[in-house]
């Protein structure tokens, strides 16, 4: 439902996609019970949500992962919500960290990130993780979205 | 504060309720510092939030639980946010999983779920967990809500 | 972008600040990629977000901490989102609990809290933790905010 032509609702919710790429940037898709309100927010290259209008946005991500302390590096599993604005440095907006489980073969844990940020036209947000191979892609486990205030 | 008669604010926040029922669906109550903006969202049978208007909603749940690896099944504790729409499949919207703690008698952990979804008139959302007996019902620990964009 | 003079957007997102104070109330700052929409929400004494207008607000906090089971008390790490309204008792709105990790020297974990609440003019919200010395203040790890519906 639109608030009016001048002020349409802008919202997105995308679903995690397993990827053979070795990049730490998570991949997303418009599948399952996804949301893409209109073309004022788009999923670009399966990796970032890009907005056309300046304003305040509540941005969130949820990442479920399965890891084991012995099989993983000493460092914890970290998920980062990052911002790329035209002509600016990339920025970390939010991060969460969970130490690996001692459960075998691996222990599942879920991370939730969310916050209100000002985005410029053409700004993109994306999610980075320390080890994408540990991310769980079962129904509903890992997702990413935003809504314009 | 209303946005106008045509577009009133719609929001709810309900509080967990211990239940003797053996169902995996969590029970909720309008108690403590709860929110129920108007009759366009209702808590039905103490288990589901039902909306009267179609639109985009940010839906969230928080579940705190206390479990022990030895006393629990091998499977992790999973919380699921589910959707029931008239004449449709029930759907898993969001899930989070946490492996049981090795702490004794049990170790507390908290899960947060949240995302933007399109709801149809008469749609209901509810929360499922793998073991309701492990859920913590102390003040503020477990809650469930939504807001219409 | 404003909704109009009568109904301006109200939102805040503040960043954690390490503190030498022994209080359990977390300290925050308008630094880094913070949000403070206008003077209808303010950060007071670096510890609480105070609103001038009555209404429904989505309030959230994220706390990352690093703790060890042997070095910590038996009790879990608890983060609480609390409300102070003029002439009322303080209230706990939301809490999350995580048992300490067995990782050494400490294991990182992240907690996310969020919910919709009615706030009165002059109401303040703040975040309490069981042990502020365990909180992680690296970029993006610990933050606190709200948005008016």
């Amino acid at each position: 439902m639109q608030k009016g032509d001048q002020n349409p609702q802008i919202a997105a919710h995308v679903i995690s996609e397993a990827s053979s790429k070795t990049t730490s940037v998570l991949q997303w898709a418009e599948k399952g019970y996804y949301t893409m309100s209109n073309n004022l927010v788009t999923l670009e290259n399966g990796k970032q949500l890009t907005v056309k209008r300046q304003g305040l946005y509540y941005i969130y991500a949820q990442v479920t992962f399965c890891s084991n302390r012995e099989a993983s590096s000493q460092a914890p599993f970290i998920a980062s919500l990052c911002l790329k604005s035209p002509g600016r440095f990339e920025r970390i907006l939010l991060r969460a960290a969970n130490t690996h489980s001692s459960a075998k073969p691996c222990g599942q844990q879920s991370i939730h990130l969310g916050g209100v940020f000002e985005l410029q036209p053409g700004a993109s947000v994306f999610v980075n993780v320390t080890d994408p191979s540990q991310v769980s892609h079962g129904t509903g486990f890992t997702s990413f979205g935003l809504l314009k205030l | 504060m209303q946005k106008g008669d045509q577009n009133p604010q719609i929001a709810a926040h309900v509080i967990s309720e211990a239940s003797s029922k053996t169902t995996s669906v969590l029970q909720w109550a309008e108690k403590g510092y709860y929110t129920m903006s108007n009759n366009l969202v209702t808590l039905e049978n103490g288990k589901q939030l039902t909306v009267k208007r179609q639109g985009l909603y940010y839906i969230y749940a928080q579940v705190t639980f206390c479990s022990n690896r030895e006393a629990s099944s091998q499977a992790p504790f999973i919380a699921s946010l589910c959707l029931k729409s008239p004449g449709r499949f029930e759907r898993i919207l969001l899930r989070a999983a946490n492996t049981h703690s090795s702490a004794k008698p049990c170790g507390q952990q908290s899960i947060h779920l949240g995302g933007v979804f399109e709801l149809q008139p008469g749609a209901s959302v509810f929360v499922n967990v793998t073991d309701p007996s492990q859920v913590s019902h102390g003040t503020g620990f477990t809650s469930f809500g939504l807001l219409k964009l | 972008m404003q909704k109009g003079d009568q109904n301006p957007q109200i939102a805040a997102h503040v960043i954690s600040e390490a503190s030498s104070k022994t209080t359990s109330v977390l300290q925050w700052a308008e630094k880094g990629y913070y949000t403070m929409s206008n003077n209808l929400v303010t950060l007071e004494n670096g510890k609480q977000l105070t609103v001038k207008r009555q209404g429904l607000y989505y309030i959230y906090a994220q706390v990352t901490f690093c703790s060890n089971r042997e070095a910590s008390s038996q009790a879990p790490f608890i983060a609480s989102l609390c409300l102070k309204s003029p002439g009322r008792f303080e209230r706990i709105l939301l809490r999350a609990a995580n048992t300490h990790s067995s990782a050494k020297p400490c294991g990182q974990q992240s907690i996310h809290l969020g919910g919709v609440f009615e706030l009165q003019p002059g109401a303040s919200v703040f975040v309490n933790v069981t042990d502020p010395s365990q909180v992680s203040h690296g970029t993006g790890f610990t933050s606190f905010g709200l948005l008016k519906l």
Partner: nanobody, 123 residues
Framework: EVQLVESGGGLVQPGGSLRLSCAAS????????MGWFRQAPGKEREFIAV????????LYADSVKGRFTISADNSKNTAYLQMNSLKPEDTAVYYC????????????????WGQGTLVTVSS
């Protein structure tokens, strides 16, 4: 489009069991979930169970929880509904349905439907 063919219906006594099958053909790769609805005479079609093709997660209507089990055999492109402890009120035409993968929350996607199979529970 996905073609669905149900089988396994019939007459059974109260307390008995039946296993329904739903064989899918056509654009199987486009299926997100498969499940079962039922319609009793003079009543609305009601949801019974669903299974997600992706990972085997399932959900059930309260009326059948603990008695019915949904499963899938991906190699045979078939979904099953094992019905135990059947009651007279389970009497209905049972329909298999498939939901497309990229259905999205912003549109009510049309399901693909089977022709239905009759289950009668009576002594």
């Amino acid at each position: 489009e996905v073609q669905l063919v149900e089988s396994g219906g019939g007459l059974v006594q109260p307390g008995g069991s039946l296993r329904l099958s739903c064989a899918a053909s056509g654009s199987i790769s486009s299926v997100n979930a498969m499940g079962w609805f039922r319609q009793a005479p003079g009543k609305e079609r009601e949801f019974i169970a669903v299974i997600y093709w992706r990972d085997g997660s399932s959900l059930y209507a309260d009326s059948v929880k603990g008695r019915f089990t949904i499963s899938a055999d991906n190699s045979k492109n078939t979904a099953y509904l094992q019905m135990n402890s059947l009651k007279p009120e389970d009497t209905a035409v049972y329909y298999c349905a498939a939901e497309p993968y990229g259905s999205g929350s912003s549109l009510i996607s049309e399901y693909d439907w089977g022709q239905g199979t009759l289950v009668t529970v009576s002594s």
